[in-house]
């Protein structure tokens, strides 16, 4: 088999004898899977990432690669091992015929195989530059800490590191892994090759137009002169960063990935591993005016995914497309007409637009936050980014209707002071993927490893759902929502909070026999109620109304429909106090809200009663939103009455700790 570029001499015709002594059978009952990019034009058939099981050692990876070569040679196929992965993910990159996939999937230790695919710079026009001087007074923006303790890695095009705006701030590593440029007549003009990366380096750390003016950067070249790279090249780049981190541990690391490709299991997995090694990854949501969950690394939960807004806080339109959106976006940031260093000359500036520019802003803000508080974990940093964002300023009408509720209405902002936020109880809302419409379909929302799940709710556009419950999965609580017969699917909504030294548990009451409804409370000493969930097996709860307001003196109680099981999230943490706040509207209304007061954080959001005309409940920042079916379809007024129940908490312990520091 000839490979496309005719590079035969380096291909290894492995000897048949290599196979001898390597007859380990694949683990019984496990089947490796094959994955490829859903976007056909972005596929790169002929190159495959073979991902091995987690505990596979380097020697086993090498042996498995040799075994593949030997078995391929036996069948008359040439293969070439391009890279053996270790340090981040075990596995190898192989150039081979697709005919060999079945064989490769049966090799020992193989977890899955992914066909290589393209990734792209996320700026427009990333190579059509309009030179403009900085259009503001530089002394208007003097950040308190310029991010000097933080190193920002940039995986992008080559960059002009001696540009006046970034000279001395960027160390160009010797890492380069890029595909050939497309087209026979492509002219490799240096300034165009450097355009995207130079601009982003300037946005992050430029002297005059940068966000974190003190941050130092390291650049890795994973995008070619056309702004195109590969998943495999990006993986090898991430591995390079991990190895550098191990060889020479420095302070906090931020990795900026201003690129996007189709959904990639392996790229997301690599990002997860790097994030769990303490690295903060920031990526572009993508410029496809589409759900960011369909792209990588934007869809990786551990990555901070950034959409783009303009000066009017509106989502950025880019030609016929625009910023991506949806539940995989963490927040938005400026991404239209952003001025930064231009590679056209050493003192030139240019304006570029896209989610790359937005991600660069957030990488700069992250660098400054980490420089001020180097011990911040990824979860703490993400929560702070969300907390300090401008809320509810984006015009959601720009997003498709079904994505509006899922897309965070947050625009990144620098904290007013980089210190002193430690006393806050930080929480965020995490939406699951859609369950799909089958009768038994469920959706699961998860918090990050060092966050606590304090409450769980669900939402269905059709209203046909069977509630939600918190359950243990792999030693951690998750939020599971249940679809109902005839439903179009549900979402699970987790409220994920930073609560140090917390001990949380779920108390469940089965459906009540009596007509008073189901109740459950936190009975352990020192435990407070942080959230209520209800789950039912019947298809339609009907109109039964339990007493909505709790009896006085029983704040630690969840109440619900008599046919539903009720789940109380009960937590003990130093100084944690919570209170229930309700807002009931007697007349039918499509939306009922209740918000926590200043100084209190929303941890739980649920609806009473749990009848079928209630679409669900979810938290938006510090407000609990309960949505009901269109009033015109609900029938009687009594059934239309809905109460939004918020549980608001604060931590006196965190407040005291903060005061002691000051």
């Amino acid at each position: 088999q000839e490979d496309e570029d005719g590079d035969y001499e380096e291909l290894v015709l492995a000897l048949r004898s290599e196979e001898d002594g390597l007859a380990e059978a694949p683990e019984h009952g496990t089947t490796a899977t094959f994955h490829r990019c859903a976007k056909d034009p972005w596929r790169l058939p002929g190159t495959y990432v073979v991902v091995l099981k987690e505990e596979t050692h380097l020697s086993q990876s090498e042996r498995t690669a040799r075994r593949l070569q030997a078995q391929a040679a036996r069948r008359g196929y040439l293969t070439k091992i391009l890279h053996v992965f270790h340090g981040l993910l075990p596995g190898f990159l192989v150039k081979m015929s697709g005919d060999l996939l079945e064989l490769a999937l049966k090799l020992p230790h193989v977890d899955y195989i992914e066909e290589d695919s393209s990734v792209f710079a996320q700026s427009i026009p990333w190579n059509l530059e309009r030179i403009t001087p900085p259009r503001y007074r530089a002394d208007e923006y003097q950040p308190p800490d310029g991010g000097s303790l933080v190193e920002v890695y940039l995986l992008d095009t080559s960059i002009q590191s001696d540009h006046r705006e970034i000279e001395g701030r960027v160390m160009v590593t010797d890492f380069e892994n890029v595909p050939e440029e497309d087209g026979t007549r492509f002219h490799r003009q240096a300034s165009k090759c450097d355009s995207h990366g130079t601009h982003l380096a300037g946005v992050v750390s430029g002297r005059d137009a940068g966000v974190a003016k003190g941050a130092s950067m390291r650049s890795l070249r994973v995008l070619n002169c056309q702004g195109k790279g590969t998943v495999s090249g990006t993986l090898i780049g991430l591995e390079f960063i991990r190895k550098s981190q191990l060889v020479q541990p420095v302070g906090p690391l931020v990795v900026l990935l201003p690129l996007a490709g189709g959904y990639s299991r392996v790229l997301n997995a690599a990002c997860q591993r790097l994030a769990r090694a303490g690295v903060v990854l920031v990526t572009a949501a993508g410029n496809f005016r589409d759900d960011a969950c369909l792209y990588s690394p934007a869809s990786a939960p551990e990555v901070i995914t950034v959409g783009a807004t303009n000066a009017q806080d509106q989502p950025v339109t880019l030609g016929t497309l625009g910023t991506n959106f949806g539940r995989c976006v963490d927040l938005f940031a400026p991404g239209e007409d952003i001025i930064g260093a231009s590679s056209d000359c050493s003192t030139c500036f240019v304006s570029q637009s896209g989610t790359s520019q937005a991600a660069a802003h957030v990488a700069g803000i992250a660098a400054m936050m980490l420089s001020a508080e180097p011990e911040l974990t990824l979860a703490e940093l993400r929560q702070r980014l969300i907390h300090f964002s401008a809320k509810d300023v984006i015009n959601e009408a720009w997003f498709p209707e079904d994505q509006r509720v899922l897309t965070p209405n947050l625009v990144a902002a620098l904290p007013p002071s980089t210190h002193g936020a430690g006393w806050q109880l930080f929480c965020r809302t995490v939406w699951s993927a859609h369950s799909g419409p089958t009768r038994m379909a469920t959706a699961v929302a998860r918090c990050a490893p060092d966050e606590e799940l304090l409450s769980c709710s669900s939402f269905s556009r059709s209203g046909k759902r069977r509630g939600e419950r918190m359950e243990a999965q792999g030693g951690k609580l998750v939020c599971r929502a249940h679809n109902a017969f005839g439903g179009e699917g549900v979402y699970a909504i987790a409220r994920c909070c930073l609560l140090p030294q917390a001990n949380c548990s779920v108390h469940t009451a089965p459906p009540a026999e009596a007509s008073m409804g189901t109740r459950v409370h936190c009975h352990q000493q020192g435990h407070v109620l942080t959230g209520c969930s209800s789950h039912w097996e019947v298809e339609d709860l009907g109109t039964h109304k339990p007493p909505v307001l709790r009896p006085r003196g029983q704040p630690n109680q969840c109440v619900g429909h008599r046919e539903a099981s009720i789940h109380a999230s009960c937590c003990h943490a130093p100084g944690l106090e919570c209170k229930v706040k309700e807002h009931g509207i007697p007349a039918p209304q499509e939306q009922v809200t209740v918000a926590c007061e200043e100084g209190w954080t929303l941890t739980g959001c649920s609806a009473l009663p749990g009848t079928s005309h209630v679409l669900g409940a979810y938290a938006v920042d510090n407000t609990c939103v309960v949505r009901s079916r269109d009033v015109s379809t609900t029938g009687s007024t009594s059934e239309g009455a809905v109460t939004a129940v918020a549980i608001c908490c604060r931590s006196r312990h965190l407040a005291q700790a903060s005061q002691e520091l000051q």
Epitope: P133, P134, R137, D139, Q160, R164, E167, V170, D208, K213
Partner: antibody
Framework: QIQLVQSGAEVKKPGASVKVSCKAS????????ISWVRQAPGQGLEWMGW????????NYAQKVQGRVTMTTDTSTSTVYMELRSLRSDDTAVYFC????????WGQGTTVTVSS | QSALTQPASVSGSPGQSITISCTGT?????????VSWYQQHPGKPPKLMIY???NRPSGVSNRFSGSKSGNTASLTISGLQAEDEADYFC?????????FGGGTKLAVL
């Protein structure tokens, strides 16, 4: 350590050319260009231009544009500044300095233009 | 004629503080964060003392500090010492080049 070492003093006649060299060491050359600055006797500093070690691009001050050429030899980590059609008011000490930030300076090269 | 205006001379006694000003326009000092200050002793190359308005390179005494307001940058030297006697130059970016001040001769009395 980071060093910029310049060539020795030159005496030239009006109308002639001079070529001063500056050898850089001790840092990643491509992260910084080299600026050239001159100082006439008893006078202030005058920025003449900049050249990139990365791609050879140049940025010349208007006052000397057309008479100055800056070049690099990456194999020897050396930058050259050639000034043509010398006049008596070009008599000065010529310094090379690292980048636009000019955080490290060469020792200076005295160029005397005299008939 | 230099693009940035500095006083020709400034003097002070040991232990005192002095301030040297550097005035430009919104196209140089006022428009950029990159104002630097250099110290030059006779027969020596200039030495960077302050960069990007107020940052000190490692090895430079914390007696030297920089600031900026509008189109004017300032260098302050506190606790004057005899070795501070030298010429001081400010510099700034412009849109495409660099400009220096005419220099200020500091005498320590």
């Amino acid at each position: 350590q980071i060093q910029l070492v310049q060539s020795g003093a030159e005496v030239k006649k009006p109308g002639a050319s001079v070529k001063v060299s500056c050898k850089a060491s001790g840092y990643t050359l491509t992260s910084y260009g080299i600026s050239w600055v001159r100082q006439a006797p008893g006078q202030g500093l005058e920025w003449m231009g900049w050249i990139s070690f990365y791609n050879g691009n140049t940025n010349y001050a208007q006052k000397v544009q057309g008479r100055v050429t800056m070049t690099t030899d990456t194999s020897t980590s050396t930058v050259y500044m050639e000034l043509r059609s010398l006049r008596s008011d070009d008599t000065a000490v010529y310094f090379c300095a690292r980048g636009y930030g000019m955080d490290v300076w060469g020792q200076g090269t005295t160029v005397t233009v005299s008939s | 004629q230099s693009a940035l205006t500095q006083p020709a001379s400034v003097s002070g006694s040991p232990g005192q503080s002095i301030t040297i000003s550097c005035t430009g326009t919104s196209s140089d000092v006022g428009g950029y964060n990159s104002v630097s200050w250099y110290q030059q002793h006779p027969g020596k190359p200039p030495k960077l003392m302050i960069y990007e308005v107020s940052n000190r390179p490692s090895g430079v005494s914390n007696r030297f500090s920089g600031s900026k307001s509008g189109n004017t940058a300032s260098l302050t030297i506190s606790g004057l010492q005899a070795e501070d006697e030298a010429d001081y130059f400010c510099s700034s970016y412009t849109s495409t080049s660099m400009v220096f001040g005419g220099g200020t001769k500091l005498a320590v009395l």
